[in-house]
Interface confidence: low
């Protein structure tokens, strides 16, 4: 029979693996098998025999299995033996690549290539490549032979450069045992180089500026170079140098900035191997927003008018408004806010609305207040000019200038001008008590002259509404002056003469100077002194005069300024007729009687009759009353011839009678000598 062993002669097994040796016979039906080592040490294996085949299994393979194994087959009396040598090795894993730290450009790093659990070490070789470049190689042939598993390493120190990015680091381990098939005797590990760059060149760009206004916005962008690309972190330096983290984005946008947002902002670029930071200081300045009140810092409002106060915030996007009075009295108006404007409407203003109104505008937690003074006034009508009478040249006249319903009258000034000349000016500065409407009067007296005609009387009322008002409110009334001149130099012309013969015509013409031109009024003066109007014509004409037309005729020149009167006596002369001389009780009387001698003439006045008593010594004119002469107690010497003569420029008549007076004792007549 024959014996075979498999594998033949020599085999190699990896520690820890399973290894089977098979011994088989041919030409023997039921052989007996036995196994032993050449030096009779323990088998350290299991035997399983089945028919003509016996299998020695080493599981797991260990150092104790490194022997020559002998298989003996007995068939009957025949015995055959075969041996096989078992070599062991250990090369279980790919090498490991280790770094002393991250691969940072420019910083030396140590690379270690480890071959773990190697046996036999003296046959080990380790190569380290960077890309195609062999960096280091080591053979461990000089190592002492020991029956143990060892880990061997190869170290290289190099300084990474940017060009190393993407290159491969190859660690290759070889175990030089001839029987090992090629896939087992060489192992390698490939590691792509992860090269790092610590953050650097960290820069901040700020838009629009590092100096900002309240309420504004700023965008700060941070960039930092490095590998891997640095992560960006934003923070703000607090007083104690502690950094307050704000954001993890490259861009930091701050909106609606306040002054307290001023400070140092820090941007930090961070990656696995380092950090780099940059700082910027932001200065948030207060936004110079302005509060404007219109119509102005002082508003004059007429009683009953509507006042609209507008408060505007200029340079503030979203202001908040509030209105109050300086004395915090109730606000009588309606407030309406719209965007950057607020209006306070005071409808039908009265004295109670006279205040300082304050508009407070809050913008970004900052408040500005602006004031306007509402001054209520009443000045509804033009002044009224009244005069005590018509204007007469040379005659004093009192002028009243009345300004009705004024408030506040302690700011009132009334001026009265004649042409360009101020006649009087009055300031009403007395203390005001309760607020009320008052009527104020300026009164003055002046003497008009004819030269004032054509000029005007101007009453100028000024209401000074407040200290800040440049121009006072002004009202005026103008009254043209027309100065009257009282009639004067009234003259009467009588044509042909004031003494006329009855039946003659006569014209009485009157003229009078004055302004306006006087109206002429002819009148006749009656016996009781009253005037009887006759005509308003300049000329009074008598076509045929009668004795009754004789008398005093009065011409009056009349205008608004007065009356000028002139009179003329018209004498209508007649030739005396029908003269009668009578005595009462008779022509012959007793001594002591009362005697009345009367002379009448039908067509002439009694005043034109002369009574005389004839005597040797000359005629004696008697004092007659209405043509009558009364002797109270007749005396003897009253006896005589009495003569009555009626005489005019145009003729005369004479009558006479003899009075006889009888004596009481002698009872004889007494005749005056004649």
């Amino acid at each position: 029979f024959k014996i075979e062993i498999s594998p033949e002669y020599k085999t190699i097994a990896q520690i820890g693996d399973s290894m089977a040796l098979t011994c088989s016979t041919t030409g023997c039906e039921s052989p007996l098998f036995s196994w032993r080592t050449q030096i009779d040490s323990p088998l350290n294996a299991k035997v399983r025999t089945e028919g003509s085949k016996s299998v020695l299994t080493m599981e797991p393979v260990s150092f104790e299995n490194e022997h020559s194994y002998l298989c003996t087959a007995t068939c009957g009396s025949g015995k055959l033996e075969r041996s096989i040598h078992v070599d062991i090795y250990s090369f279980p894993k790919d090498p490991e690549i280790q770094f002393s730290g991250p691969l940072e450009v420019g910083k030396p790093v140590t690379v270690k290539c480890l071959a773990p659990d190697i046996y036999p070490v003296y046959r080990l070789e380790i190569d380290l490549f960077k890309g195609d470049q062999l960096m280091n190689r080591q053979e461990f042939s000089s190592e002492e032979m020991t029956k143990s598993l060892e880990t061997k390493s190869l170290e290289v120190t190099f300084t990474p450069v940017i060009e190393d990015i993407g290159k491969a680091l190859v660690c290759r381990a070889k175990l030089h045992i001839d029987q090992i098939d090629s896939t087992l005797k060489e192992r390698e590990t490939v590691k792509e180089l992860q090269v790092y760059i610590s953050p650097r060149n960290t820069t901040i760009s700020v838009h629009p500026s590092t100096r900002l206004q309240e309420g504004g916005a700023v965008t700060m962008t941070c960039s930092s170079e490095g590998l891997p690309a640095p992560e960006i972190f934003w923070g703000r330096k607090l007083d104690n140098e502690v950094l307050q983290l704000l954001s993890g984005n490259a861009t930091l946008t701050l909106i609606a900035m306040r002054m307290e947002d001023s400070g140092v902002y820090v941007c930090e670029g961070v990656n696995l191997i380092g950090r780099d930071k940059a700082e910027v200081e932001l200065v948030v300045q207060e936004k110079p927003f302005i509060v404007d009140i219109s119509p102005g810092s002082q508003v004059a409002a007429q009683v009953g008018d509507s006042v609209v106060l507008t408060c505007a915030a200029i340079g503030c996007d979203s202001p908040s408004f509030s209105w109050r009075t300086q004395t915090d009295s109730p606000l009588n108006g309606v407030v309406r806010n719209e965007g950057a404007k607020s209006t306070l409407v005071l409808s039908s203003v009265g004295f109670e609305d006279e205040h300082s109104y304050l508009c407070a505008v809050t913008c970004l937690q900052r408040t500005l207040e602006k004031r306007t003074q509402v001054e209520v006034y009443s000045f509804p009508e033009d002044p009224v000019i009244k005069m005590s009478g018509p204007l007469v040249h040379g005659r004093p006249v009192t002028v009243n200038c009345t300004v009705p319903n004024v408030y506040p009258f302690d700011h009132l000034e009334i001026e009265l001008l004649k042409g360009e000349t101020t006649l009087m000016k009055k300031y009403f500065l007395e203390e005001m008590g309760i607020k009320s409407l008052e009527t104020k009067i300026l009164e003055t007296t002046f003497i008009p002259t004819i030269e004032d005609t054509g000029k005007s009387l101007v009453c100028l009322a000024r209401l000074h509404s407040g200290e800040m008002e440049s121009e006072p409110k002004q009202r005026q009334s103008v009254q043209p002056l027309y100065v009257n001149v009282a009639p004067k130099e009234t003259t009467i012309w009588v044509s042909p003469s004031p003494i006329l013969e009855e039946g003659s015509p006569v014209n009485l013409t009157c003229s009078s100077d004055g302004i306006p031109a006087p109206k002429i009024l002819w009148s006749r003066q009656l016996n009781n002194g009253e005037l009887q109007p006759l005509s308003e014509n300049t000329t009074l004409t008598f076509m045929s005069t009668k004795r009754d037309d004789s008398g005093i005729y009065v011409c009056e020149g009349i205008n608004e300024a007065g009356i000028s009167r002139k009179s003329v006596e018209l004498i209508i002369q007649v030739s005396p007729k029908d003269i009668q001389l009578t005595v009462f009780p008779s022509k012959s009387v007793k001594e002591g009687d009362t005697v009345i001698i009367s002379c009448t003439c039908g067509n002439v006045p009694e005043t034109w009759i002369i009574l005389k008593k004839k005597a040797k010594t000359g005629d004696m004119v008697l004092k007659s009353v209405d043509g009558s002469y009364t002797i109270r107690q007749a005396q003897l010497q009253d006896a005589g011839i009495y003569e009555c003569e009626s005489k005019t420029e145009v003729g005369s008549q004479l009558r006479s009678l003899t009075l006889d007076v009888k004596g009481k004792e002698h009872n004889k007549d007494y005749f005056s000598p004649e």
């Epitope: 001023s262 200065v283 207060e286 110079p288 810092s297 304050l358 900052r366 500005l368 207040e369 004031r371």
Partner: nanobody
Framework: QVQLQESGGGLVQPGGSLRLSCAAS????????MSWVRQAPGKGLEWVSG????????YYADSVKGRFTISRDNAKNTLYLQMNSLKSEDTALYYC??????????????????KGQGTQVTVSS
């Protein structure tokens, strides 16, 4: 804490000069408009003068224009008011205040707008 400390006031004859100073602390002085205001006896506050953050723009009330000069030194956190040709009407307590001012009610009616204790200026013969 915002603090403003005025100094430099005193008694001066009409036509004389004074220089007021205001030392500021507790805030970024260079970021603020500043003003001088005054209060005459028995009267309200009156704005006198204002200056912008870097001193390039100055503002004056009509009553002091041509006589007073406002200036600032941001490095020293100090505001100044040079007062020349002083008149008796300039007698008042002078304050420095933050804020742009421009009229009596712009700045000093709100607590947000701090002002100092004041320095007395008396103009009298």
């Amino acid at each position: 804490q915002v603090q403003l400390q005025e100094s430099g006031g005193g008694l001066v004859q009409p036509g004389g000069s004074l220089r007021l100073s205001c030392a500021a602390s507790g805030f970024t002085f260079s970021s603020y408009y500043m003003s001088w205001v005054r209060q005459a006896p028995g009267k309200g506050l009156e704005w006198v003068s204002g200056i912008n953050v870097d001193g390039s723009n100055t503002y004056y009330a009509d009553s002091v224009k041509g006589r007073f000069t406002i200036s600032r030194d941001n490095a020293k956190n100090t505001l100044y008011l040079q007062m020349n040709s002083l008149k008796s009407e300039d007698t008042a307590l002078y304050y420095c205040a933050t804020g742009s001012g421009r009229d009596s009610y712009d700045c000093y009616s709100g607590s947000w707008c701090p002002k100092g204790q004041g320095t007395q200026v008396t103009v009298s013969s």
